[in-house]
């Protein structure tokens, strides 16, 4: 069956954890991608802004989880949730705005 | 104030088992990420392991000398670590530390912060 | 398994400049940390990230990376600074720390 969105919620903050401990290194060589409004549609919109990422093994898990809680198909070049693209920040950036907001979301118990 | 205090150290024969415990107080345990090292005598620091924090999936890693003999522990409510150690060994005799773990000091929840206990001291001999 | 390597000891006389390297393959990509620890008593945290420096700790140390080498350079090294220290770092998962084999540094009183 589908799995529930705690369960997904925290592997998805594990997997941003995997990605970022004690790295100094650019991710996925300093790549820069859309910054994105962390409210409603954020699981969308971080898919949408990752995915035109290629080529970067160390992200693919993370997005194959925000696959999983998008609820629509989400392919590269689409932007329908990413409502303002005026800034674009590293991954490594991204991925720790991402988590901060992730954990958040979590000890407020708000799953979805 | 900022403190871990270890205790359940003590002498034991080879093959026995002891169990320590660092108990923490001054920050918010629950975020923070959790690391055993250890010092035999005259010699320098090995780390022995670490736990997450629960929210970041509580992982817990060893090192490959310890690695099916101990196990890391956390109780968040009663802010405690713990170091099972059983199987020992002469070589496991050492001042173990337990520590707030650097690696894991990110995000806003206790970001830079170092804290170490003062250490108790297992023996293992005959 | 993934090793640090530093200079069993360093002397200095008081006032120079003392530099305790640490070297590892992982190093260009995850960060190092330097820990203090005098006779009998805790380590304490000197310098994290390569570079950062905690608070409470003298702005004579410093700390710096390039390629596979981690450096913490004493700038006018003091009697009290006497002590062993070590670096640390992780392997390249992040996930199984390592410290180097310390480095005893002697400051000629």
């Known amino acids: 069956g589908p799995v529930p969105p705690s369960t997904a919620l925290r592997e998805l903050i594990e997997e941003l954890v995997n990605i970022t401990q004690n790295q100094k290194a650019p991710l996925c060589n300093g790549s820069m991608v859309w910054s994105i409004n962390l409210t409603a549609g954020m699981y969308c919109a971080a898919l949408e802004s990752l995915i035109n990422v290629s080529g970067c093994s160390a992200i693919y898990r993370t997005q194959r989880i925000l696959h999983g809680l998008c609820p629509h198909k989400v392919s590269a070049g689409q932007f329908s949730s990413l409502h303002v693209r005026d800034t674009k920040i590293e991954v490594a950036q991204f991925v720790k705005d991402l988590l901060l907001h992730l954990k958040k979301l979590f000890r407020e118990g708000q799953f979805n | 104030e900022v403190q871990l205090v270890e205790s359940g150290g003590g002498l034991v024969k080879p093959g026995g088992s002891l169990r320590l415990s660092c108990a923490a107080s001054?920050?918010?345990?629950?975020?923070?990420?959790m690391s055993w090292v250890r010092q035999a005598p005259g010699k320098g620091l090995e780390w022995v392991g670490r736990i997450r924090s629960k929210i970041d999936g509580g992982t817990i890693n060893y090192a490959a000398p310890v690695k099916g003999r101990f196990t890391i522990s956390r109780d968040d409510s009663k802010n405690t670590l713990y170091l099972q150690m059983n199987s020992l060994k002469t070589e496991d005799t050492a001042v173990y530390y337990c520590?707030?773990?650097?690696?894991?000091?990110?995000?806003?929840?206790?970001?830079?912060?170092?804290?170490w206990g003062q250490g108790t001291t297992v023996t293992v001999s005959s | 398994s993934y090793e640090l390597t530093q200079p069993p000891s360093v002397s200095v006389s008081p006032g120079q400049t003392a530099r305790i390297t640490c070297s590892g393959d992982a190093l260009p990509e995850k960060y190092a940390y330097w820990y203090q620890q005098k006779s009998g008593q805790a380590p304490v945290l000197v310098i994290y990230e390569d570079t950062k420096r905690p608070s409470g700790i003298p702005e004579r140390f410093s700390g710096s990376s390039s390629g596979t080498m981690a450096t913490l350079t004493i700038s006018g090294a003091q009697v009290e600074d006497e002590a062993d220290y070590y670096c640390?770092?992780?392997?390249?998962?992040?996930?199984?720390?390592?410290f180097g084999g310390g480095t005893k540094l002697t400051v000629l009183g």
């Open positions: 640390y770092s992780t392997d390249s998962s992040g996930n199984h720390g390592v």
């Open positions: 001054g920050f918010t345990f629950s975020n923070a990420w």
């Open positions: 520590a707030t773990d650097q690696v894991g000091a990110y995000y806003g929840d206790y970001y830079g912060m170092d804290v």
